[in-house]
């Protein structure tokens, strides 16, 4: 899977998008989850309703709502008071019994409120010199990971 | 009326190939994944892969990966099994089976089966 | 691979009996469990998904019940048409696993 980055700025909403076919996960659950580490476990965040014909209905876990748009075929994030803490890598699942297959790998990066005067080394998101495999270029209000880009900050 | 209607029973030598196939009628077929069974000489269920016709996704049991390659044609309703290299070992019924998945339980049962191919190898 | 157990592998039973077959999951399937009737020369048949669902057109005779590791499969009184071999098979992780079978006969 190819990685997807979204943009958004610290204290502000982010919504994240994952297109599916709607078919292909006919009757199937949603999830979000956060990966930890590189090789890590994917840690669900937040899922959609357990009764899938009410996936339209938005599930909230803390600052963070998921929605299934299960016809159109297009699950919906909301990472509401984005903070630096929320930067790294998630991926948008799809469940059936108790596996999950990855709807779309997601790369979040925290930008600095540009209004907000205090430090922003706290806020991190990759740099072009850090390495990635299989990401593509995809310009809006998100992105796909550059050639060279890695997901996760270089650790010590 | 839903029906996988498979194709006829094959005896082959060792280490000949085979491909079986299933015609799936009577609903859309790119919407369900298509998986194969087999059975064995008097014996159990065994699960071998899954395939999605409409993206062609697939997966395999760990002890069938490598040994045979599930195929579909979509174009023509028609999901495959096959083999490059048979072993007496495989000789036995193989079935293709429409996975459904149910609404309330976001897991998927075989509801249609295919009425079987039995697949004899011989010297 | 979740291993499936089924016990007893064979019973004896008569018409109008009340028959339990169980299947034991190597590891928590919560309900993701599945029933099958087999005759001779057939392609098995859905009776049972969800641990509890009843197949459309299955008779209500039959009911399943479990969660976790331990299933049942209970026929309320059996018909003649029931004698044949059933499988239990768990949908909760790939590869998708089955039962060894239990096989019904007359008595």
């Known amino acids: 899977h190819n990685t997807t980055v979204f943009q958004g700025v610290a204290g502000q909403s982010l919504q994240v998008s994952c297109p599916y076919d709607s078919m292909k996960h006919w009757g199937r659950r949603k999830a979000w989850c956060r990966q930890l580490g590189e090789k890590g476990p994917c840690q669900r965040v937040v899922s959609t309703h357990n009764l899938w014909l009410l996936s339209f209905l938005r599930r909230w876990n803390g600052s963070t709502a998921i929605t299934d748009d299960t016809l159109g075929g297009t699950l919906t994030i909301t990472l509401r008071n984005l903070q630096p803490h929320d930067a790294g890598l998630y991926q948008c699942q799809s469940l059936h019994g108790s596996e999950a297959d990855t709807l779309r790998k997601v790369l979040v990066e925290v930008l600095a409120d540009p209004l907000d005067h205090r430090d922003a080394g706290d806020l991190w998101f990759p740099g072009e010199s850090e390495s990635f495999e299989d990401a593509h270029v995809e310009h809006s209000i998100s992105r796909s990971l550059l050639e060279g880009e890695i997901p996760f900050p270089p650790t010590s | 009326e839903v029906q996988l209607v498979q194709s006829g029973a094959e005896v082959k030598k060792p280490g000949e190939s085979l491909k079986i196939s299933c015609k799936g009628s009577g609903y859309s077929f790119t919407s369900y994944w298509i998986a194969w069974v087999r059975q064995m000489p008097g014996k159990g269920l065994e699960w071998m892969g899954i395939?999605?016709?409409?993206?062609?996704?697939?997966r395999y049991a760990p002890s069938f990966q490598g040994q045979v390659t599930i195929s579909a044609d979509k174009s023509i309703s028609t999901a495959y099994l096959q083999w490059s290299s048979l072993k007496a070992s495989d000789t036995a019924m193989y079935f293709c089976?429409?996975?459904?998945?149910?609404?309330?339980?976001?897991?998927?049962?075989?509801?249609?089966w295919g009425q079987g191919t039995l697949v004899t190898v011989s010297s | 691979d979740i291993q499936m157990t089924q016990s007893p592998s064979s019973v004896s039973a008569s018409v109008g009996d009340r028959v339990t077959i169980t299947c034991r999951a190597s590891?928590?399937?919560?309900?993701?469990l599945a029933w099958y009737q087999q005759k001779p020369g057939k392609a098995p048949k859905l009776l049972i998904y969800a641990a509890s669902s009843l197949q459309r057109g299955v008779p209500s005779r039959f009911s399943g019940s479990g969660s976790g590791t331990d299933f049942t499969l209970t026929i309320s009184s059996l018909q003649p048409e029931d004698f044949a071999t059933y499988f239990c098979q768990q949908a909760d992780s790939f590869p998708r696993t089955f039962g060894q079978g239990t096989k019904l006969e007359i008595k």
């Open positions: 089976v429409r996975s459904r998945t149910f609404y309330y339980d976001s897991s998927d049962y075989f509801d249609y």
């Open positions: 590891q928590g399937i919560s309900s993701w």
């Open positions: 395939i999605y016709p409409g993206d062609s996704d697939t």
